[in-house]
């Protein structure tokens, strides 16, 4: 959480921004919020990235204003523009490109003053890991699947009953390029794993980590997955 | 006050080469990227190149990669533009601007020097 003031004195507001993640390929959100005005009128925003020389997107007067935005950003921006009034200045992002990615801005203009905070924006690709038992296996098989990954992660299997045991030796993983040639399949097989227990895959990069959990009984498989995006800070 | 002033336009043979240099003042110039764009009569100014603060990340306009090159001299303040094999439509006033992101920025800040005219002509 990053939160800055402006630096006039008493002209001066909060604003607050959350550092997040992208999915590349898939929309995105740069939260910001500030303290709130009663006049939309009275409201600018503006949001800007280090090293582009255009703005990212400007909405003032309670509509976007958008003749010096910068060509990277052409038709990907918007503003919740009925939450405005409320304080949020939050930024959607279409289609998040790995370019996306760097220090943002995101800086206001109210009648009680004007105020600013830096968020950092990672860009990747993240997915769900689904585990499944591998009956065309010889012997008792796992494998688990998520389809896109950016940058290439690591592969971590653990089980409930063998707590700390190293799974290396007994397990291969691969990556596979997708068609835009960016991000990648991860496949991950796990061999002579035991009945009545319950398997993790666990898939990480710099921005996400995602668990794939199945547990196999003689009557029944159950399986669970969840990700968690990495390093949320808020200014 | 941001003050950017630019040099070495003029009138340049198809094939030839020009410097164009920046003279950047009232900021702290290694804090910041800097950009080079340029715009052509009755058209909006066009991003062409840009150098982080401390000039080891560059990148540039497809239209201008590979014939133009961009460095800076932070002890000097200075930026620079090598413009090799410089063809007609290369023509245009050449602005060199100060990155928006930074502490100081305020809304309507002018980021941008009065450009220099390049002429690319047989």
């Known amino acids: 959480l990053i939160i800055g003031f402006g630096i006039s004195g008493r002209h001066s507001i909060t604003v607050t921004t959350v550092a997040s993640a992208g999915n590349i390929g898939e929309d995105g959100i740069l939260s910001c919020t500030f303290e709130p005005d009663i006049k939309l009128s009275d409201i600018v925003i503006q949001w800007l990235k280090e090293g582009v020389l255009g703005l990212v997107h400007e909405f003032k007067e309670g509509k976007d204003e958008l003749s010096e935005q910068d060509e990277m950003f052409r038709g990907r921006t918007a503003v919740f523009a009925d939450q405005v009034i409320v304080g949020n200045a939050s930024l959607r992002l279409k289609n998040v490109q790995l370019t996306d990615a760097g220090t943002y801005k995101c800086y206001i203009i109210t009648s009680k003053g004007k105020g600013n905070a830096n968020l950092e924006y990672k860009t990747g690709a993240f997915s769900m890991p689904e585990v499944n038992v591998d009956y065309n296996a010889s012997s008792e098989t796992l494998r688990c699947e998520a389809p896109r990954w950016f940058p290439q992660p690591t592969v971590v299997w653990a089980s409930q009953v063998d707590q700390g045991a190293n799974f290396s030796e007994v397990s291969n993983t691969s990556f596979e390029l997708n068609s835009e040639n960016v991000t990648m399949k991860v496949v991950s097989v796990l061999y002579n794993v035991t009945i009545n227990n319950t398997y993790s895959c666990m898939i990480e990069n710099d921005i996400a980590k995602a668990t794939g959990d199945i547990k196999v009984t003689e009557s029944e498989i159950k399986r669970r997955s969840h990700l968690q995006l990495l390093n949320s800070k808020a200014s | 006050e941001v003050q950017l002033v630019e040099s070495g336009g003029g009138l340049v043979q198809p094939g030839g080469s020009l410097r164009l240099s920046c003279a950047a003042s009232?900021?702290?110039?290694?804090?910041?990227?800097m950009h080079w764009a340029r715009q052509v009569p009755g058209k909006g100014r066009v991003w062409i190149s840009r150098?982080?603060?401390?000039?080891?990340?560059?990148s540039y306009a497809d239209s201008v990669k590979g014939r133009f090159t961009i460095s800076r001299d932070n002890a000097k303040n200075m930026v620079y533009l090598q413009m090799n094999n410089l063809r007609a439509e290369d023509t245009a006033v050449y602005y060199c601007?100060?990155?928006?992101?930074?502490?100081?920025?305020?809304?309507?800040?002018?980021?941008w020097g009065q450009g220099t005219t390049v002429t690319v002509s047989s």
């Open positions: 009232g900021f702290a110039f290694s804090n910041y990227w």
């Open positions: 150098i982080s603060g401390d000039g080891r990340s560059t």
């Open positions: 601007a100060r990155d928006r992101f930074g502490d100081d920025y305020y809304y309507g800040m002018n980021v």
